[in-house]
Interface confidence: medium
Amino acid sequence: LQDLCSNCPAGTFCDNNRSQICSPCPPNSFSSAGGQRTCDICRQCKGVFKTRKECSSTSNAECDCISGYHCLGAECSMCEQDCKQGQELTKKGCKDCCFGTFNDQKRGICRPWTNCSLDGKSVLVNGTKERDVVCGPSPADLSPGASSATPPAPAREPGHSPQ
């Protein structure tokens, strides 16, 4: 009995009501493995989800997020609202990055600016809400005789710029 069912390929199910014959998956369902007694319900890309790949009898649908949202989780299991660069998503919506932090993407959290002095370097370009600071050569690299393509910026830690 089981041997008959194991012959049923992906895209079919082993139909107990019809003497173990292989029946095609019902509409809007799929079986990605052989030998199944039932097919799986196709994923429906509704609401904030949009269809990236249609369901077939052997593979599930794949979803993306509509404009203004981005995927989270395995196989885009959730859609999260986009924010602007220089913002992060909180429970109350998109909020500007606090001073001393930045976010250069439409998703994720604001991260602290790099502390150039930890590496013995100086700030070459100040940080903003959207961009990290750019660290320049260390003061030692700028001593007479050292070659430097760029002049040092005013050393303001931790990278202050008016917001």
């Epitope: 107990n16 009501n17 029946s23 019902p26 007694r37 039932t38 799986d40 429906q44």
Partner: antibody, heavy 118, light 111 residues
Framework: QVQLQQSGAELARPGASVKMSCKAS????????MHWVKQRPGQGLEWIGY????????IYNQKFKDKATLTADKSSSTAYMQLSSLTSEDSAVYYC???????????WGAGTTVTVSS | DIVLTQSPASLAVSLGQRATISCRAS??????????MNWFQQKPGQPPKLLIY???NQGSGVPARFSGSGSGTDFSLNIHPMEEDDTAMYFC?????????FGGGTKLEIK
């Protein structure tokens, strides 16, 4: 013969979680999807969702997406449903049901009664 | 969601007579010529029992006096002749579209 044996009644406090089981016997567990259905006292039936024990693929009724978590253990032929953040609205009988090929529930467990009370 | 409306909510039928229960769907539950409509019987303290699947196919071991018909949005369950053992709640259920939904139920009693 084909049977679905569900775990015993649960009494829980509001805010707590419960995990109930549904042990399958008499058939090959991994070849059928397992669905879960809720029935409140004297009321109708509500479909919660299902799990394919082979692929661990799940689909939930959006209404229960943050309430129920479905899992399956192939080695013991057992499906599980965990209900979280319980409220009085979750007091009900919960059934597991095997899905036949043409998308009907052909075998049902006897049900697990969950009572939420402080 | 597809809403299933059953009528009547309760019904009393004499032994040997015909009982007819209707189920109307808020949209078609047909797909590629298949009606994804099932019927269940439930007695107090018991789980539901499959009677009819795909609108008109009898479940395993279901007596011939139970029959189902319909397509699209309108379906019916017929019980003839009515027997004492048929006193129960009856539910329709669609499996065309997630979330799968059930009708509100019809209570069938003996007159």
């Amino acid at each position: 013969q084909v049977q679905l044996q569900q775990s015993g009644a649960e009494l829980a406090r509001p805010g707590a979680s419960v995990k109930m089981s549904c042990k399958a016997s008499g058939y090959i567990f991994t070849t059928y999807a397992m669905h879960w259905v809720k029935q409140r006292p004297g009321q109708g039936l509500e479909w919660i969702g299902y799990i394919n024990p082979t692929t661990v693929y799940t689909i939930y009724n959006q209404k229960f997406k943050d309430k129920a978590t479905l899992t399956a253990d192939k080695s013991s032929s057992t499906a599980y449903m965990q209900l979280s953040s319980l409220t009085s609205e979750d007091s009900a009988v919960y059934y597991c049901a095997r899905l036949g090929g043409h998308w009907y529930f052909d075998v049902w467990g006897a049900g697990t009664t969950v009572t939420v009370s402080s | 969601d597809i809403v299933l409306t059953q009528s009547p909510a309760s019904l009393a039928v004499s032994l040997g007579q015909r009982a007819t229960i209707s189920c109307r769907a808020s949209e078609s539950v047909d797909n590629y010529g298949i009606s994804f409509m099932n019927w269940f019987q439930q007695k107090p303290g018991q789980p539901p029992k499959l009677l009819i699947y795909s609108a008109s196919n009898q479940g395993s071991g279901v007596p011939a006096r139970f029959s189902g018909s319909g397509s699209g949005t309108d379906f019916s369950l017929n019980i003839h002749p009515m027997e004492e053992d048929d006193t129960a709640m009856y539910f329709c259920q669609q499996s065309k579209e997630v979330p799968w939904t059930f009708g509100g139920g019809t209570k069938l009693e003996i007159k």
